[in-house]
């Protein structure tokens, strides 16, 4: 008789999850000399230890701290790019502007990017059938708590001018319920961070509105100002041209507004 298994509303653990995490770790440590000392088997053991045999709706930040410890990484604190609902462009940008870093350019972010995982209470099995959905099941699930933990630490490490890329095509350009809005904004350290600069990315080619005047951006400005951090905002009207100009800043067309 097959053992009863909890059915969650979200997709199950990504297939070949252990192999993927281990392979990504090896690849990352080969590419990044400053992380060559990392023992990827130990990293996987700590990752696994965070959620295996634990109820997937009862995961805490504490569970991930051993993984955080092994994945501790120093990135230039004044070169941090946060993003919300516009991951692909943010990653394209840091692939060109190599001295800037998103969370997914760090070891721990890279390991988990686009993956899903969860276990089952009191068994050492990984659940490949289903995992809790943040809205329909529970917020304290392995994936959500992981991203909350690494995002908090990433924001805490930031200094000087911090940039954030926001999606101007969304109804809420700044969303208080996003990871950026609920975690990162509140963990920027006012004694280290001077300014948060928002880049609002326009979607339509003919969109010439000043999205920095959007009510949700004003809300972000208010939150940031109350935390004694300065706020500035720029419209990126042509994201394609923006990326092109990051690649070739001396191009004559790059002096005009993008």
């Amino acid at each position: 008789v097959p053992r009863w298994r909890q059915q969650w509303s979200g997709p199950g653990t990504t297939k070949r999850f252990p192999e993927t995490v281990l392979a990504r770790c090896v690849k990352y440590t080969e590419i990044h000399p400053e992380m060559r000392h990392v023992d990827c088997q130990s990293v996987w053991d700590a990752f696994k230890g965070a959620f295996i045999s634990k109820h997937p709706c009862n995961i805490t930040e504490e569970d991930y701290q051993p993984l955080m410890k092994l994945g501790t990484q120093t990135v230039p604190c004044n070169k941090i790019l946060l993003w919300s609902r516009i991951k692909d462009l943010a990653h394209q940008f840091t692939q060109v502007q190599r001295d800037m870093f998103t969370l997914e350019d760090t070891l721990l972010g890279y390991l988990a990017d686009d993956l899903t995982w969860c276990g089952e209470f009191n068994t050492s099995k990984i659940n490949y059938q289903s995992c809790p959905d943040w809205r329909k099941d529970c917020s304290n699930n392995p994936v959500s708590v992981f991203w909350k933990t690494v995002s908090r630490r990433f924001a805490e490490a930031a200094c000087d001018v911090v940039h954030v890329m926001l999606n101007g095509s969304r109804s809420k350009i700044f969303d208080k319920n996003s990871t950026f809005g609920s975690v990162e904004v509140h963990n920027l350290q006012p004694e280290k961070v001077q300014t948060l600069e928002a880049w609002v990315i326009h979607g339509g080619r003919e969109d010439s509105r000043d999205l920095c005047q959007d009510p949700t951006i004003k809300e972000l400005e208010s939150i940031i100002s109350k935390r004694n951090i300065q706020f500035s905002c720029k419209n990126i009207y042509r994201p394609d041209k923006f990326l092109q100009c990051v690649k070739n800043p001396e191009d004559s067309s790059c002096t005009s507004e993008i």
């Epitope: 700590a46 051993p66 092994l70």
Partner: antibody, heavy 119, light 107 residues
């Protein structure tokens, strides 16, 4: 029976060196992070150093960084603490402790070995 | 200077309930453990993972954690509970840190 047994404590002059050992028995030594913790006379507990299960990662308190080295030999079930450039303030009872599942707590402690740094 | 703060002393009479507290910002995101050190002996784990008791520890010992503070409660105080009690957790650098210790006297 789960046991940790420290040895190697001694009276040593300032600037001298000492190597502490901790033998483990009754559990799978190679599965666990291990720590050294010290206690100066009449004072509280102070964490000194940690080592990961496979020995590939080590961490140190600022007060001993660059002077002490934690290591382990999983084939011999033994934990070590190499102490160099010893100072009077390193005088303490040194305990080795087994970490329960990384950060749950230190569930097994040795009886301690005394290090005295004095001229 | 420890980043976990404990009162240096506490006291109670036999049968009483006493509470020992521990506070520090790192408690918020890290597990807390509690240790009992009887005079002249090595520390012994009393509580792990915030509130769980290892087998063999009497259920007179309980613990809780909320935000940046944690507490250990001992009910039905006995003379053999006279000892030093230490809290511990990982700090913001994810290294172990101990509280300064609380000396419990049974009056």
């Amino acid at each position: 029976e789960v046991q940790l047994l420290e040895s190697g404590g001694d009276l040593v002059q300032p600037g001298g060196s000492l190597r502490l050992s901790c033998g483990a028995s009754g559990f799978t030594f190679s599965d666990h992070y291990m720590s050294w913790v010290r206690q100066a006379p009449g004072k509280g507990l102070e964490w000194v150093a940690d080592i990961s299960a496979r020995g590939s990662n080590t961490w140190y308190a600022d007060s001993v960084k660059g002077r002490f080295t934690i290591s382990r030999d999983n084939s011999e079930n033994t934990l070590y603490l190499q102490m160099n450039s010893l100072r009077a303030e390193d005088t303490a009872v040194y305990y080795c402790a087994k970490n329960w599942n990384y950060n749950y707590g230190m569930d097994v402690w040795g009886h301690g070995t005394t290090v005295t740094v004095s001229s | 200077q420890s980043v976990l703060t404990q009162a240096p002393s506490a006291s109670g009479t036999p049968g009483q309930r006493v509470t020992i507290s521990c506070s520090g910002s790192s408690i918020q995101n890290n597990y807390v453990s509690w240790y009992q050190q009887l005079p002249g002996t090595a520390p012994k784990l009393l509580i792990y993972r915030n509130f769980e008791r290892p087998s063999g520890v009497p259920d007179r010992f309980s613990a809780s954690k909320s935000g940046t503070s944690a507490s250990l409660a001992i009910s039905g105080l006995q003379s053999e509970d006279e000892a030093d009690y230490y809290c511990a957790s990982w700090d913001d650098s994810l290294n172990w840190v101990f509280g300064g210790g609380t000396k419990l006297t049974v009056l």
